[in-house]
Interface confidence: low
């Protein structure tokens, strides 16, 4: 029988009048144009939703925008629209909500044509009141604000200024002309590229990259021939013209670009590129595209200092620049990602890893799947994900997978199981042990949300008809109910619910439509009455992640230690509640090969734990690039995983040796580097 | 095992509209496509239209636009194809066929082909006044 | 729409032969392309898929080749069942086109 048809499925007591009792619609007055929400702040209910509607004129466009205020997570909205003077706001620059909890809101409206710059509304109460701001420059982008202080904004200006703010968007100073991109480092460091002759584009290759670190009184450049540059983790990164040709390579620096080394990474010509698809403070995914238009590149992995790189992934799927990657980390459990390989035969095929990119295996067929047409073994096949590349090829799959920190070991996505990715009706599958195994949790496409850190699951059928009926978990997606949460159904268009996962409220936003008009309606459900007690202890129990061997005593050991988490059981129907925190307790592993990515020069064979050296570099010296001088390596073949915690057991030798050579590949060495103050 | 099975023979008249049937077994009905493909006597292959069983979309053949409606009944794992103000020409053998079409990367919309691999045993429209 | 091209018409075989039956299409279908066979009185059977996998419970003296533009379906070993009639079709970019035919007779 279909998931959540079983006999066993045991009914929540009562849930249609305890739903009926918190399910809360506002119908917006106004007519059906575009609307966008943003959560204001942590755990505050605040939501702000802009609706607007555009009247093409003959000659202009005419639009016009209003702006809601809930602070009760959605159930009463406020027509706030008088507090920014009716004005109207440029969706394509959003809200531009403030970090953490600072409570901070920036609202661009549009101008005339005629007028000497932008217009802004700032907020530093949650949306409760707005000041307007006329600016000095028009803006290109949204206001980006610095992560450390939300006082501190940047922004580029329609003639390639780059604006800085100090008092949260009171007072502006243009700081540098001639600005392509600007980003905020740490510590409100400004790192912006720089074109010297015609503009952003004419440079391309030959830009300068600046750095500020007191909000522009003083400037270092820190690179020339400069192609772009990224920011991950802590590592920035560059991506450098070479000097005799149109090739460029990536250099990297831990230092804020004080010192740089160059990546050990295959350069790439004008049509290829390169795409940070994961980073954090150990080390970097890195793609890179192949030459010609495959649609395909290789992941390589960083050591922890981001150059050296070890192949990864072979022909993973990435379109081109900008185009799409299914590329996922799976945040409820630590090391796992899932991706997408173009195969020889042109079908594309999901990939997984558990220990953070060091080996890729395909999913494990659901148990209670049979494999489609595209098995060439009836019984042989694998789950395949569908993610952005599905999406962006109009397949009927309204969502990404989706996973949460707090949701232990739940990863839900849209997939079909065979030997590649089907463009039939895709089903929603669940794992509950971030990815080893899996489950399919609902026929057909359907919208979905984590609510409660686990502890429900909601979903909504994607439909072109209008609907009235969501579907709810408290299980995991086991069991599902149904409840109609509206007479008059209504054509959905989205779930909105907190970012974190930690509310019981969920959001379904739609328009109804008539004769005459349509107009945006929401309907706010609160499922605290579903989840009446809070869990008590009794209701967890012990889980140990990456767990595939229970008698091997190195079961659950990935990237060196192993953990146990406490987790909700499946059969209790209660609150983990705000203020949950996921218990884990870790554990440090003996090193074992496992332990190791395969160091420059060395690749692991498919099935196999041993590094083996590249038949064409066999006999060569192992040469790389750090810090601007050449190094010999001398290795056996592998160096420790970034992050990896690991302590004994194996410790193959590897060594480096200063060949005292200079290798900046034109890049500006440290004492090359000038500085200016303003 | 899997099955296509479609309705019996018809006999119409210029101007008038005929529906085909095409019940599905052996299989899940909604996890494959289901194209509609005709043969006039002594003649070649001609690809109508295809249907997804999911939401019922279908995307027809510009020569067909029109006049021709495909739809199915998840119920009884049916589809239908209904061809409407009928000519001599459209004399012919219809058949369903399952189609699972599969998708690949490189390129626009690009996809790997599985071919139709399943088709029911065609019904004759004759149309003649 | 992708118009595909068969050649040749007719083929006269004897059995235990060779043949060689080829399809062009007029724009690149990558390897988007199925072989069929068909009889008198019978539905079409799919033969090829992917330009040259052969599907279930097809003999392995069929195979196809080709990829882009120029196909070719080989039946290395023509026995009495394999006179035909054969279509490829694309499916590369909607309408999905048949070519127009081979027909493989006794010589």
């Known amino acids: 029988s279909a998931p959540g048809e079983d006999e066993e499925c045991g009914r929540v007591r009562d849930f249609v009048a305890k739903l009926a009792n918190n399910t809360h619609q506002h119908v917006f007055d106004d007519l059906r144009g575009s609307v966008s929400l943003s959560w204001v702040g942590d755990s505050t209910g605040v939501i702000l939703v802009l609706t607007t509607f555009h009247v093409p004129l003959v000659i202009m466009t005419f639009g016009q925008s209003k702006l809601y205020r809930s602070e009760d997570y959605g159930k009463n909205f406020k027509d706030i629209t008088d507090l920014i003077n009716n004005t109207f706001i440029r969706t394509e620059f959003g809200m531009a909500i403030g970090p953490e909890n600072s409570g901070k809101v920036v609202l661009t409206a549009e101008v005339s044509g005629g007028s000497r710059g932008g217009r802004i509304f700032r907020s530093s109460d949650f949306a409760k009141n707005f000041v307007q701001t006329d600016l000095p420059f028009h803006p290109l982008t949204q206001m980006m604000y610095s992560p450390q202080n939300s006082d501190y904004l940047l922004a580029l200006s329609t003639e390639n200024g780059l604006w800085v703010s100090k008092n949260f968007g009171g007072k502006w100073e243009e700081i540098h002309k001639a600005v392509c991109l600007a980003k905020w480092g740490s510590d409100n460091t400004i790192f912006f590229t720089t074109y010297a002759n015609g503009s952003c584009k004419a440079d391309l290759g030959a830009l300068e990259l600046w750095r500020t670190s007191d909000l522009g009184k003083s400037f270092k450049t820190i690179g020339v021939k400069i192609y772009s540059f990224g920011l991950g983790g802590r590592f920035l990164f560059a991506s450098v013209m070479a000097d005799k040709d149109t090739t460029r390579r990536i250099h990297v620096s831990t230092d804020q670009g004080d010192t740089w080394s160059m990546a050990q990474l295959p350069s790439v010509g004008q049509e290829q590129f390169y795409s940070i698809l994961a980073a954090n403070d150990d080390m970097v995914f890195m793609h890179v595209d192949e030459p010609g238009d495959t649609g395909f590149g290789t992941i390589f992995t960083s050591d922890d200092r981001g150059i050296v790189y070890s192949k990864s992934l072979d022909r993973h799927l990435y379109t081109t620049t900008g185009g799409e990657t299914d590329f996922t980390n799976v945040t409820s459990l630590r090391g796992v990602y899932i991706t997408s390989v173009l195969s020889e035969d042109n079908s594309i095929q999901t990939m997984i890893t558990f220990d953070q990119g060091g080996r890729w295996t395909h999913l494990r067929k659901p148990e209670n799947s049979e494999c489609d047409a595209t098995a060439k073994n009836k019984n042989e096949c694998s789950l395949h994900i569908h993610a952005s590349y599905s999406i962006s090829q109009k397949l009927n799959v309204p969502m990404a997978p989706l996973s949460e920190p707090n949701a232990v070991g739940i990863v839900i996505a849209h997939g079909s199981v065979g030997d590649a990715i089907s463009v039939m009706v895709p089903d929603v599958y669940i794992s509950d042990d971030g990815g080893y195994s899996w489950t399919k949790m609902l026929e057909g496409p359907h919208y979905y949300t984590i609510l409660d850190s686990g502890g429900i699951i909601v979903a909504i059928e994607h439909s072109s008809r209008p609907i009235n009926v969501i579907k709810f978990s408290t299980d995991e997606g086991q069991c599902w109910q149904t409840y109609t949460f509206t007479r008059d159904p209504i054509y959905f268009t989205g779930l909105a619910s907190e970012p974190g996962a930690r509310s019981m409220n969920i959001s379904i936003w739609g328009f109804t439509e008539s004769f005459l008009t349509s107009q945006w309606v929401s309907y706010t459900i609160d499922f605290k009455d579903i989840l009446e007690r809070n869990c008590e202890e009794k209701d967890y129990t012990i889980w140990l992640a990456h767990s595939t061997d229970p008698e091997d005593y190195e079961d659950g050991c990935i990237l060196g230690y192993k953990e146990q988490f406490l987790r909700l059981r499946k059969s209790s129907v209660c609150q983990n509640g705000r203020d949950y925190v996921v218990t884990k307790q870790p554990s440090i592993c003996l090193c074992s090969l496992e332990d190791f990515l395969c160091d420059f020069g060395y690749y692991r064979p498919e099935n196999d734990s041993k590094c083996v050296e590249q038949p064409e570099l066999k006999g060569h010296d192992l040469e790389f690039c750090l810090y601007g001088r050449e190094e010999h390596l001398t290795t056996n073949g592998y160096r420790k995983i970034p992050g990896d915690k690991c302590q004994g057991g194996v410790n193959p030798v590897r060594e480096v040796k200063d060949l005292k050579k200079k290798c900046t590949s034109n890049f500006l060495s440290p004492e090359k580097q000038n500085s200016k103050s303003n | 095992q899997v099955q296509l099975v479609q309705s019996g023979a018809e006999v119409k008249k210029p101007g008038a509209s005929v529906k085909v049937s095409c019940k599905a077994s052996g299989y899940t009905f909604t996890s494959r496509y289901m194209s509609w493909v005709r043969q006039a006597p002594g003649q070649g292959l001609e690809w109508m239209g295809i249907i997804n069983p999911v939401g019922g979309s279908a995307s027809y053949a510009r020569k067909f636009q029109g006049r021709v409606t495909m739809t199915r009944d998840t119920s009884t794992s049916t589809v239908y194809m209904e061809l409407s103000s009928l000519r001599s020409e459209d004399t012919a053998v219809y058949y369903c066929?399952?189609?699972?079409?599969?998708?690949?990367?490189?390129?626009?919309?690009?996809?790997?082909?599985?071919?139709?691999?399943?088709w029911g045993q065609g019904t004759t429209v004759t149309v003649s006044s | 729409e992708i118009v595909m091209t068969q050649s040749p018409a007719t083929l006269s075989v004897s059995p235990g032969e060779r043949a060689t039956l080829s399809c062009r299409a007029s724009q690149s279908v990558s390897s988007n392309l199925a072989w069929y066979q068909q009889k008198p009185g019978q539905a079409p059977r799919l033969l090829i898929y992917?330009?040259?996998t052969r599907a279930t419970g097809i003999p392995a003296r069929f195979s196809g080749s080709g990829s882009g533009t120029e196909f070719t379906l080989t039946i290395s070993s023509l026995q009495s069942e394999d006179f035909a009639v054969y279509y490829c079709?694309?499916?590369?970019?909607?309408?999905?086109?048949f070519g127009g035919g081979t027909k493989v007779e006794i010589k």
């Open positions: 079709q694309q499916a590369r970019l909607g309408p999905w086109t």
């Open positions: 992917g330009a040259s």
């Open positions: 066929a399952r189609d699972p079409s599969g998708i690949a990367a490189a390129g626009p919309a690009s996809r790997y082909y599985y071919g139709m691999d399943v």
